[in-house]
Structure formats: C-alpha cells, structure tokens
C-alpha cells in the first residue's frame, strides 16, 4: 500500500500593500511549530491588483469591492480551505493614502471603511486596513530584508544564501522607493540619532538595535516627477515645457488641474495663463539631474548633517538593500549588477535619456508607453536621490545592492509587518521561557 503523506502543519498569512500606484497581495507560509525561528516564513504568492492605488477610488468607492476580487479569490485558491478561517489578512496603505488623508481625513476614512467592508466578506481572519506611518514602512522594510538575509539568526553560516550576503551579523540598511514616498533605514555606527523622530529601538532575538529611519513624503518617483513639473512650469515662457527628463521627440499634454491635485505640488502652485501645457522631451541627463536637485533643499540643516529639507541623516554605514522601485527601475535599465560602478550607471543613463523616443518605443515594444516614457526621469531621480540626497559616493555605491527578491520573497515592508503583527519576532532567543506579547516588537 502507498504511504499517505501526513498533512503539513503550516500556517498562512496575507498582507495587502496598498501603495500609491497599485495594490499587491502577498501570501506567506510557515511551519506552525517553527514560527519563532528566524527565516522560516516565505512568500508563496504575489498577486498584483488590476488598476490604480486605492486613493484613486475616492470618487468611486463602490468599485473597491470588484477591484479587490481577483486577488482575494486567488488567495482563496492558494490557501487550503481548512486554513481559511485561521489565516490573518492585513491591509497596510502607504503614502498615497497619507496624501489623501492630508487633503481630507473624511475621504481617506471613507475609502478605508469600504476597503474593510469588502475584505471582511472573505472567509479569512480579517484584521483590518489602516494607513501605516512612514516610520513603520521604513522599519518593516528593514526587518523584512534582515530577516530574509538571516541577520537575526545567531548561528553563523559558512555559506551564503544570496550572492551579496556577507557572513557577518551586521544588518543591511534598507532603501525603499515607492510612488509617493521613499524610506531610508539603517543602524548607524556608534552615532547618536540626533532627532528623536528618526530613532527606533528594537530588541530582536536577544539583541538590541538602534535604528535610524526617515520617510520622505512626496519624494517617491511619481510625486517627485509631479513636483519637478510644477517647479519647471513656473518659469516656462508659454504652454510648452521643454523637459530634459524625457526622450527627444516625446510629447505629452498635461492638465494643470492634475498637476496641482496633489499636496506635493502645493509649494510650487501659481496661477498659470493656460489650463494645459505640453511636455516636449529633449533627453539630457545632466540637465534633468540639475532640475531634480532643485527639489532637495540642502541649504538648511539644524543637525550635524542632513539628507535634505533639514532632515537629520547619520553617516552611512554598511551595506544597503535597495528595493521596490529602486529595483524595478534599475532592473529595467539593466543596472542592477554588482559589477556596475556609479560612473558606469551615470554613463548608461546619459545614453539612455538621449535616445530618441521613437527608437525607445521600437526597442521596448512590449512596455506600456506611460511607464516607458518615465524611465529616464526615474533612473536620473534614483541617482540624484542616492548621491545628493543620501550622500552615497562613487566608492560607497558598491555597498548598494539592488534587490527584488531574497530567497523567493519580495523585499518590502509587508513581510516585516506581518511578522510583527503575528508576534513572530521574539525579543529574546526562542529557546528561552515563553514570552508575553508585550515583549515583542
């Protein structure tokens, strides 16, 4: 007779990342008896929800239920039915919803209310939808990558699980780029964190971590582009904006009302003598870079050193994982290799931005024009942000590792968020006495 396999004693968790440009659903799985061990949780599925971010549903909240259906049904298929009622579901909304809340708390609450009602109709253990803070977003991203890299494990391995992993227990810093915000999080070297808002203290697996984090709202790649356009149109002599961040020959009409819709452009808002303007690409990396630098105020710093806009930033320390849009953009541009120096990246960007739009469209025929048109800006923005914003240098560039996945799990805040909410990161080493919930992160 054939041996029947014993049913797996596993658990599942679902996190929805409600970002500014889209929503993604992640399904995680782990062995039930090992949930306090480090590195046992892994991602089994990612489902990208079709459509924009949830903040765009403010005038059509009745469509939210349908919007979420496909990915929630996918979760129903992937997770065994017997596990449905025990599977927690969390939704975390990030900077897109932070911006909507700044405009109108009532409208943001309306969206979240309908999101919660829609998600509660599935057979899972729904645990709520909320707007996470920028500090949480940075912290959970840092927890995710270090958990996946095995940095919290006390056992020193003789082998590497990923190419860029060093075998020491020094944690990686986390660099996260979204559409509406960007986060920088790392453990500084013996440096006092001069601003309390940027300081986090963790005790994880028996070790204390003093972590620096900051989230720059409006400095995600999409909002940064809106900022740049709002800034540049101020000095345009007519309704044509010759833009170095777009390929030569590229043309696009922008509504002024769309430009000023976001709180991120308020500081540049002015009465213009036209309702629309046309972007005409001229494809010049250097000029694009210069225009982007004007978004960073580096003239004021009340601390020993700053990133930009008067925000404290300690000296950079150790290796960094750069993920989310840092990775997607650099991957598209074929610039994620460890061997590519910062000088080489700059050279490649100069060439890429100078390529005519018609040529670009032919070379990347399968890519949506909306996304394709913005890679020159996004790539230049990433360089500007890392070099001038965060003070990476040609030498320290090699410490930036552009990461999409680590051992099959996406780098990002969602895994860290779930680990925390399910109490799977103990403060002490798991072999000690059972812990009360208060001792967790």
């Amino acid at each position: 007779t054939q041996n029947k396999a014993l049913p797996e004693n596993v658990k599942y968790g679902i996190v929805l990342d409600a970002g500014s440009s889209h929503t993604s659903l992640y399904i995680y799985k782990w062995p039930a008896e090992k949930e306090n061990d480090t590195g046992v949780v892994h991602q089994v599925e990612e489902c990208r929800v079709k459509g924009p971010g949830i903040s765009k549903f403010v005038q059509k909240v009745n469509e939210i239920g349908i919007y979420l259906t496909d990915c929630m049904e996918r979760a129903r298929e992937v997770i065994p039915r017997s596990q449905h009622q025990e599977t927690p579901v969390y939704l975390g909304a990030t900077a897109g919803m932070r911006l909507l809340r700044m405009e109108s708390e009532e409208l943001a609450d309306r969206v979240l209310d309908v999101v919660e009602r829609s998600l509660s109709n599935y057979p899972f253990d729904f645990q709520g939808a909320r707007i996470i803070t920028g500090q949480e977003e940075g912290a959970y991203g840092w927890i995710t990558i270090n958990y996946l890299l095995g940095k919290f494990s006390q056992k020193t391995r003789w082998f590497s699980i990923v190419p860029y992993e060093t075998n020491n227990q020094e944690t990686f810093g986390a660099l996260d780029l979204g559409g509406a915000s960007t986060q920088v999080t790392f453990v500084p070297q013996n440096q006092t964190i001069e601003s309390p808002d940027n300081a986090l203290q963790f005790r994880l697996y028996g070790k204390d971590y003093n972590v620096y984090t900051h989230s720059f709202l409006c400095y995600g790649k999409d909002q940064a582009l809106w900022q740049k356009l709002a800034k540049d149109i101020q000095v345009a002599s007519n309704e044509i904006l010759r833009d170095p961040c777009f390929h030569p020959g590229y043309k696009k009409v922008v509504n002024v009302s769309d430009l000023y819709k976001t709180p991120c452009t308020k500081r540049f808002e002015m009465t213009l003598p036209f309702q629309q303007f046309e972007i005409q690409g001229i494809g010049n990396y250097q000029q694009c870079h210069q225009s982007i630098l004007e978004l960073f105020n580096t003239s004021y710093c009340p601390y020993s050193q700053c990133a930009f806009n008067g925000i404290f930033l300690p000296p950079l320390q150790g290796d960094f994982g750069a993920f989310s849009a840092f990775y997607f953009v650099m991957k598209f541009l074929n610039l994620t290799s460890e061997k590519v120096s910062q000088e080489k990246v700059t050279e490649m960007m100069k060439k890429f931005c100078a390529q005519p739009w018609e040529e670009i469209k032919t070379s990347y025929a399968g890519v949506k024009e909306k996304y394709l048109s913005e890679y020159c800006f996004s790539g230049t923005y990433i360089l500007s942000l890392l070099l001038q914003g965060y003070h990476f240098t040609a030498d320290s560039w090699e410490h930036i590792h552009f990461i999409g996945k680590i051992q099959g799990s996406d780098a990002g805040w969602t895994l860290g968020y779930m680990l925390n909410l399910t109490n799977m990161i103990p403060a002490e080493q798991p072999l000690s006495t059972p812990l009360s919930h208060s001792t967790y992160v």
Epitope: V61, N62, I64, G65, E106, D109, R110, L112, D113, V114, E116, R117, S118, S120, F126, Q127, G128
Partner: antibody, heavy 121, light 107 residues
Framework: QVQLVQSGAEVKKPGSSVKASCKAS????????ISWVRQAPGQGLEWMGS????????NYAQKFRGRVTITADESTSTTYMELSSLRSEDTAVYYC??????????????WGQGTMVTVSS | EIVMTQSPATLSVSPGERATLSCRAS??????LAWYQQKPGQAPRLLIY???TRATGIPARFSGSGSGTEFTLTISSLQSEDFAVYYC?????????FGGGTKVEIK
Amino acid sequence: QVQLVQSGAEVKKPGSSVKASCKASGGTFSSYAISWVRQAPGQGLEWMGSIIPIFGTANYAQKFRGRVTITADESTSTTYMELSSLRSEDTAVYYCARESGGYRDHRLDVWGQGTMVTVSS
Amino acid sequence: EIVMTQSPATLSVSPGERATLSCRASQSVGSNLAWYQQKPGQAPRLLIYGASTRATGIPARFSGSGSGTEFTLTISSLQSEDFAVYYCQQYLIWPLTFGGGTKVEIK
C-alpha cells in the same frame, strides 16, 4: 431626529425566505451605514451584516454569508434584509440600526423597533 | 473574529448601590467599544462609545473605562430604571461582535 421604522411581524415556513424592511425618516439616509442585528428569544445580540446605502456596499457575518442579502433603496430611504433557507433557529427579533460613524466607528446609535420573525411548520 | 466576554452573567444590586460590569475582548480593540442597555420588549439603546464617552442624553451616573482588552461599565448609583441587560460591542474589526450580556437585577 432620525427614526428607523421596521416592517411588521412575519410567520414563515422552514425553507422559505423572509424580507424585512427598515425605513429611515428625519435625517440623511444614504451617508450612514445600516446594520442588521438579530436576537433569538432569551438570547444575546448577533450582528448579521451591514450596508452603506450610498455605495451599495454590503458586508456580512461569516455565519450568514450566502443566506442573507442586504439591499437599500435610496429613493425611499429603505434598507432590506432578506434571509433565505429559513430554519426554526432563525426565529428571532431582527433589528436594523444606524452606524453613527464611518471607518472603525460602527457604534449603533439609532435602532428600529424590531421585526419578529417566527419560523414554524 | 473578536470574541467578547462579559462578566458576571447576572449582577444583583440594591437601588442606590454601585454596579460594575466587565467586558473582555479576545484581542485588543483599542477604545473601539460601545455599551448598550436593553429593557424587556425594547430595542437596545447606546449608552457609551469610544469606551468612555457617554452618548447623547445618557445620565452622568453611567461611565465607561478601559482600553485594549479590558473594559468596565460603572453605574454609580442604580436607579429603578437601570435594571436591564447590558451588552458590550467591539467595532474595531469586522464582524461586529457583542458580549453575551450582563443582567442587572434588583437584589
């Protein structure tokens, strides 16, 4: 002052359906959510589901999913709760109640007088 | 779902005395908790929301306290009209859930 007026008592056979109504008067109907809560004789309160009339968005307790349908008619400021495949255990008073707030504020500040539904063969 | 547990099931109190009712949530609900009063043959009435805020028209003798998982409803000096069943309800996470109720009866 908002008032919720519910339809009269019903006697139903097992396996059939019941549709109770809840009409709002004296206030803005659409923007508030309406919950349905039932109470079996001598028992506690049990939430069944909720709807935001303006959006038509309804959500239901797991126990009743597939058997209950909550709808709303904005033109008459009326919410309906239909429960199908009735059994004797569904004998209860069915209340509609207004949720006073929005996101994470689902306190029930105005209640209807209740509709008694008896399921008996 | 969040399970709400009320204690005691029955509380016998003399008029003019203080009554203390407890409600416990199976997980933290912050301060997203309401208390209701129900008299025989009547619909429930909202007394307290946000764990400690009295609803419109509710006398000052009713007070609520607590947050997270432990909550208390206190009636400082029981009047004859206060003898009823009291329910707590969490409204942090769907589904909305009620406690089993505490019957406050005349001693």
